[in-house]
């Protein structure tokens, strides 16, 4: 029963290597390195920001989703696989979509940074489906989601006349709703006898906490690298840091408060400590003073604890989505909180500066957000339907959250 399904044994290597060969050919014909003279010190500074994002994606999001008792290997490794594939496709796609007519794609540290952020959205979405899909299905999900996010950004750029690179600010919301929709499309019920696969064990929860710590340390780097203005970059970093600090305090105390015996839940904590970072993500450069970021961190922490308690039940009963990562369900709420905060701050900013375009700016922002959600839902639905095709030989529901389906173990230890 723990043997590889035929799809994974036969289709995956061929499918993945063919795709990789296609990417190599695309890189050969359509890309070249940036020939402009970048100061060496500038290069190092830019690389460090890119490095931070990679640490967040590979270690942070990789370990964050490893909190399933029998699915920790797959969570970490599949995340890395998706990141590696996603970055390659995102670089090409961003290059093709941001220049019209398409010429050669110039690869710079900035384009790698953008691509990493695009790939990170896939990792966030994957939190809703990891354990229920095989690697071949995840490859499809990477390709579709990166393409959908790129398309969203291009559409927003053309309709709302904003810079193509700036539109990544919607990626929290996009990723969350894309993932939820894909999860909704997947086979629902878990037969009796597989519930133990879904149980969170102490060690995986500790590794998930490690992932949360990596994300916590580097989160200011994800909220600031696309900002041009040094002042705005500083604001973004400081505001993110304060919001994260407050959400940690809120997470630990709120988790204890939510428990009848006042005990702290590791699952709640590793989700809620990051709440502040998500909540200020969209508006961190507009927040004028630390106290406001701290209030947002507090609100976000409380929403996270409440969400961690209620959302899984709500998703299960109302939407029929089972066993999505708590962090993922929280992204969907906090992403919206962040977008609403952005709109409020936009109004305040235009009022303070005596700009008469308030209504127009707000309409634009609501329009962008609505479009992001619509494209996330439709592309998520398309992906979900694609993943349900029989050709992928998806894991049987009895084999959900089971590393043994995918991995060669040196020995099958009892109680694994």
């Amino acid at each position: 029963s723990s043997k590889y399904p035929r799809s994974v044994r036969r289709c995956l290597p061929l499918w993945a290597l063919t795709l990789e060969a296609a990417l190599i050919l695309l890189f050969y014909f359509f890309t070249h390195y940036d020939a402009s003279l970048e100061d060496q010190k500038g290069l190092v500074a830019s690389y460090q920001v890119g490095q931070d994002l990679t640490v967040m994606a590979a270690l942070g999001l990789g370990f964050l989703t490893s909190n399933f008792r029998r699915h920790s290997w797959s969570s970490v490794a599949f995340n890395l696989f998706m990141l590696a594939l996603g970055v390659q496709w995102a670089i090409l796609l961003d290059g093709f979509l941001s220049q019209f007519p398409p010429g050669k794609v110039v690869i710079t540290l900035f384009s790698i940074r953008l691509a990493t952020m695009s790939a990170m959205s896939v990792l966030i979405s994957a939190g809703a489906v990891l354990g229920k899909v095989n690697l071949a299905q995840l490859v499809v999900m990477v390709l579709v989601e990166v393409t959908a996010l790129g398309t969203l950004r291009m559409v927003i750029s053309n309709i709302f006349n904003t810079d193509y690179h700036m539109n990544l600010r919607h990626f929290y919301v996009f990723a969350a709703y894309f993932g939820l929709t894909v999860a909704w499309c997947l086979p629902k019920p878990l037969p009796k006898g597989t519930e133990d696969n879904d149980q969170r064990a102490t060690i995986p929860s500790l590794s998930a906490m490690l992932g949360a710590l990596f994300l916590w340390m580097f989160w200011p780097s994800v909220n600031s690298p696309l900002l041009r203005s040094p002042i705005q970059r500083k604001n973004a970093m400081f505001n993110t840091y304060y919001a994260l600090a407050v959400s940690v305090v809120t997470a630990i105390s709120g988790s204890s408060l939510a428990h009848p015996q006042r005990k702290i839940s590791m699952t709640y904590v590793h989700s809620a400590v990051l709440a502040g970072g998500v909540a200020v993500g969209t508006s961190c450069h507009l927040i004028p003073s630390p106290w406001l970021a701290m209030v947002l961190g507090l609100v976000a922490g409380l929403i996270s604890i409440g969400g961690a308690k209620c959302l899984p039940v709500c998703c299960n009963r109302v939407l029929g989505i089972h066993h999505i990562s708590v962090m993922h369900s929280i992204f969907s709420l906090l992403g919206l909180l962040g977008e609403i905060t952005y709109i409020v701050l936009l109004v305040l900013h235009t009022v303070w500066n005596g700009n008469g375009m308030i209504g127009f700016q707000v309409l634009l922002s609501i329009g962008e957000l609505s479009l992001a959600i619509v494209i996330a839902l439709t592309s998520g639905l398309l992906t979900g339907l694609l993943l349900n095709l029989k050709i992928w030989k998806a894991p049987h529901v009895a084999k959900y959250f089971d590393d043994q389906v995918f991995w060669k173990f040196p020995h099958l230890a009892v109680g694994f």
């Epitope: 190092v44 904003t162 696309l226």
Partner: antibody, heavy 128, light 107 residues
Framework: EVQLLESGPGLVKPSETLSLTCGVS????????WSWIRQSPGKGLEWIGE????????HYNPSLKGRVTISKDASKNQLSLRLTSVTAADTAVYYC?????????????????????WGRGLVVSVSS | ELQMTQSPSSLSASLGDRVTITCRAS??????LHWYQQKPGKAPKLLIY???TLQSGVPSRFSGSGSGTDFTLTISSLQPEDVATYYC?????????FGGGTKVEIK
Amino acid sequence: EVQLLESGPGLVKPSETLSLTCGVSGASISNYWWSWIRQSPGKGLEWIGEIDGSTYSTHYNPSLKGRVTISKDASKNQLSLRLTSVTAADTAVYYCAREGQDPLAPTLATSGSGLDSWGRGLVVSVSS
Amino acid sequence: ELQMTQSPSSLSASLGDRVTITCRASENVNNYLHWYQQKPGKAPKLLIYAASTLQSGVPSRFSGSGSGTDFTLTISSLQPEDVATYYCQHSYGTPLTFGGGTKVEIK
């Protein structure tokens, strides 16, 4: 109010290196992007390059074929421009300028703000 | 490299006239276009940024419009102090490029 003042030699020999500095007062250089622009006699404006005051990130005009280096000294709150192998075509008025800030246009690839503060300019002649 | 083409290269108008200067980009620059005024012997001065936003301290008779590739600077009522050369400039990536300039004189 921010003030920018360009300084350096007014006369440079061909094939030598032109070195200019731009002193900034009334603003910290680490909070803005800074550009160098030049204007040849009777001609339009030509952008030379820019530097991010908070990092060492720079972008240069490809037309200057790698002859240009822009740097900063945060402790002195000043910027520098080096242009090597100068010719008579490099004779111009050299300006340093600060990029403004528009909180509603935050993006690394593009600036929504324009160059809101300029120095008075320094006339540089290249002649033997 | 993005080219900025300004027209006309020079114009002469009477005091109080409405003056319009156009600027065309060779590619889409969204609204990342700015207008400058340069008086003889002086440094350029920013008038309008992001295509239509008036820089603080600039008289309201100056206005900007346009998006994508076609932009316009309008002086609603020409004043003696508006005699200058006007430049457009894009900031949609590097290198930044300026238009050739439009010299405005009074009849």
